[in-house]
Structure formats: structure tokens, C-alpha cells
């Protein structure tokens, strides 16, 4: 039975040209983590295996950074990167599970003026 | 227990246009997530993808079929379609619906309608 | 496209016996590769996901290994009801696409 849950940052913005950290974490299991898959909608950004180690999809090696951990680091965002991530999580004996983060790129001035006033 | 469930006319002449529908059952085409995609398998068995919905509505299709082929669904009845037109007899083929993953393979296929392009 | 061969289009065995086929990737996919069982006049179905991963109810006697751009399937152990075409898929990038099949035949 599957009983892990994957906590995520959830929807997050960040400035245009800037970088963003995308972090999943698995807790609430005792599976063992064997392979995390990070994904877009239609394509793969990058594979962390406890094997192999990190690939990073071709299109994505001149801004894509892996880590911390087994998360994900985007960077020289662009609007196109606008959003749904995904992390895998493959496990053993549990299976996969799966988690969501929205990223919205916004531009300079946007995410400036949103910062200012972020309701507490 | 999530079931696809292909229909189609069967046989049509070339140069017309076909229109499939797919029937979803025990799952929301709208659960997050999930693509409902079209895939079809000629006879000598070789699968090629034509193109998905995802649950969000947006649309992506095969490159190689993009010219021909339209995607579009019906929500409230759980259903989405295929439209392909300027068929010719190379588009003879068992068309499948399925339902595809995060991780793009598809896990729940529906049985397959058998479509013919003959005059 | 990413071209997925499937060098053996038949191949012959016996119950019990271990049988492996083989799939090659025209590009690194790293691990995203996924099998699927078609048996005489049903659709395909799933057994192996990310190159190695069973999928829910798979029997045990099906594995997958491989990385980058050669990858295997193995039936440790045929049984009869095995009788089926089994593809490779790369779930790396789109457009997915698919081996030709390979069809494992019961002597």
C-alpha cells in the first residue's frame, strides 16, 4: 500500500532572466527512493537515478542545474517557461508518485510589484 | 475502474473524413494530470501516436499528422474525438484511445475500432 | 523523431525457458523507456515503465534493464499465455514512438 505523500512548493512565480529551485519532498514512507523523474507537460527535463546518477535533457543543459538534493534548478527563466513541473518519484516497493508545481514567470517589473504587496 | 471505449463508422472512401469518439468511464477527462491520447497501429502492427487532449484542454498532436488531424472533447458526456480528413487507404488502421501518464505511456487503452479506407 | 528498433521481429521459445528482446534508441533516453504486451486481439498493455519499473500487477517473471540507447526485456521464465507481440515505447520526448514488436511464439 502506497501511505508516502510528496510535499511540493505548490505554485510559485519568479522574475524573468532570473532562477528558480523546483523541490519535491517524499515523506510518510519508508520506500526507497530509486529514481526521481523531472518532467514537463510533453517533455523530460532531467532524471535523478540512484544508479546512474543526473540526466539533463539536451534541450535544457545550458539552464538546467541539478540540486539541491534531488530537486531542480532553472535558470535564465522565460515567460515560455511558464507552467507545470512534475516530479516522479520512483520507489521501491511503494511505486511512483507524483507531484505538481505551477512556476509563473513574470516580468521584472511585475514580480517586483508583486513582491511589494504579497498579502501576509 | 477506468475503461475507453473506441467508435467509428468502420469504412469510408478516401478523401473523405473520419470522425472517432472515445468514451471514458470511471474517471473525469478533466482529472488532473492525465492526457487522453489517440494511437494508431497499421496492419503489420506498427503504433504510431496522432496526438492528445490533456485534462487542462490544450492540445498537441504528432507533427507528422498535425495538417490532418483535429482533437477536441466533450466534457460533460466524458467523451473526446478524433477527426481526420483527406483519408487515403494508407490511414487503414485499428485506431485506439488511451490514457497516458505524466511520465507519457499509457496506461488504460480502450479495445480499438478498426477503421478502413477503401472505395 | 527518436527511431526505436526492434532488431528480432519473431523469436521462438519454450515454456519455462528465459527469453529476452532487445531495443535500441537512435538517441540517448536515458531510463525512459516502457514496454507493452499485445496479445492476439486485444489492445496493448503496460508491463514496464522508466526502463526497469513494473507496473501495478505485473508478474515478477518481467523485467526491463537498459539505459541510454539499448534496453532489454526479459521473461525469466515463459508461460504459455505469454504468447504475444511486446513493443518498446520512449517516453523521453514527443512525438513518442514505438519498436516495430517483437513476437514471442510457444514451441
Known amino acids: 500500500m502506497m501511505t508516502g505523500t510528496i510535499e511540493t512548493t505548490g505554485n510559485i512565480s519568479a522574475e524573468k532572466g532570473g532562477s528558480i529551485i523546483l523541490q519535491c519532498h517524499l515523506s510518510s514512507t519508508t520506500a526507497q527512493v530509486t529514481q526521481v523523474n523531472w518532467e514537463q507537460q510533453d517533455q523530460l527535463l532531467a532524471i535523478c537515478n540512484a544508479d546512474l546518477g543526473w540526466h539533463i535533457s539536451p534541450s535544457f543543459k545550458d539552464r538546467v542545474a541539478p540540486g539541491p538534493g534531488l530537486g531542480l534548478t532553472l535558470q535564465s527563466l522565460t515567460v515560455n517557461d511558464t507552467g507545470e513541473y512534475f516530479c516522479i518519484y520512483h520507489t521501491y516497493p511503494d511505486g511512483t508518485y507524483t507531484g505538481r508545481i505551477f512556476l509563473e514567470v513574470l516580468e521584472s517589473s511585475v514580480a517586483e510589484h508583486g513582491a511589494r504587496f504579497q498579502i501576509p | 475502474d477506468v475503461q475507453l471505449q473506441e467508435s467509428g463508422p468502420g469504412l469510408v472512401k478516401p478523401s473523405q473524413t473520419v470522425f472517432l469518439t472515445c468514451t471514458v468511464t470511471?474517471?473525469?477527462?478533466?482529472?488532473?494530470?492525465?492526457?487522453w491520447s489517440w494511437i494508431r497501429q497499421f496492419p503489420g502492427n506498427k503504433l504510431e501516436w496522432i496526438g492528445y487532449i490533456y485534462y487542462s484542454g490544450t492540445i498537441t498532436y504528432n507533427p507528422s499528422l498535425t495538417s490532418r488531424t483535429t482533437i477536441t472533447r466533450d466534457t460533460p458526456k466524458n467523451q473526446f474525438f478524433l477527426e481526420m480528413n483527406s483519408l487515403t487507404a494508407e490511414d487503414t488502421a485499428t485506431y485506439y484511445c488511451?490514457?497516458?501518464?505524466?511520465?507519457?505511456?499509457?496506461?488504460?487503452w480502450g479495445q480499438g475500432t478498426t477503421l478502413t479506407v477503401s472505395s | 523523431d527518436i527511431v526505436m528498433t526492434q532488431s528480432h521481429k519473431f523469436m521462438s521459445t519454450s515454456v519455462g525457458d528465459r527469453v529476452s528482446i532487445t531495443c535500441k534508441a537512435s538517441?540517448?533516453?536515458?531510463?525512459?523507456v516502457a514496454w507493452y504486451q499485445q496479445k492476439p486481439g486485444q489492445s496493448p498493455k503496460l508491463l514496464i515503465y522508466?526502463?526497469?519499473y513494473r507496473y501495478t500487477g505485473v508478474p515478477d517473471r518481467f523485467t526491463g534493464s537498459g539505459s541510454g540507447t539499448d534496453f532489454t526485456f526479459t521473461i525469466s521464465s515463459v508461460q504459455a499465455e505469454d504468447l504475444a507481440v511486446y513493443y518498446c515505447q520512449q517516453h523521453y520526448s514527443s512525438p513518442r514512438t514505438f519498436g516495430g514488436g517483437t513476437k514471442v511464439e510457444i514451441k
Open positions: 538517441q540517448d533516453v536515458s531510463t525512459a
Open positions: 522508466s526502463a526497469s
Open positions: 488511451a490514457r497516458e501518464t505524466v511520465l507519457r505511456v499509457f496506461d488504460y
Open positions: 470511471g474517471i473525469s477527462i478533466t482529472t488532473g494530470n492525465y492526457k
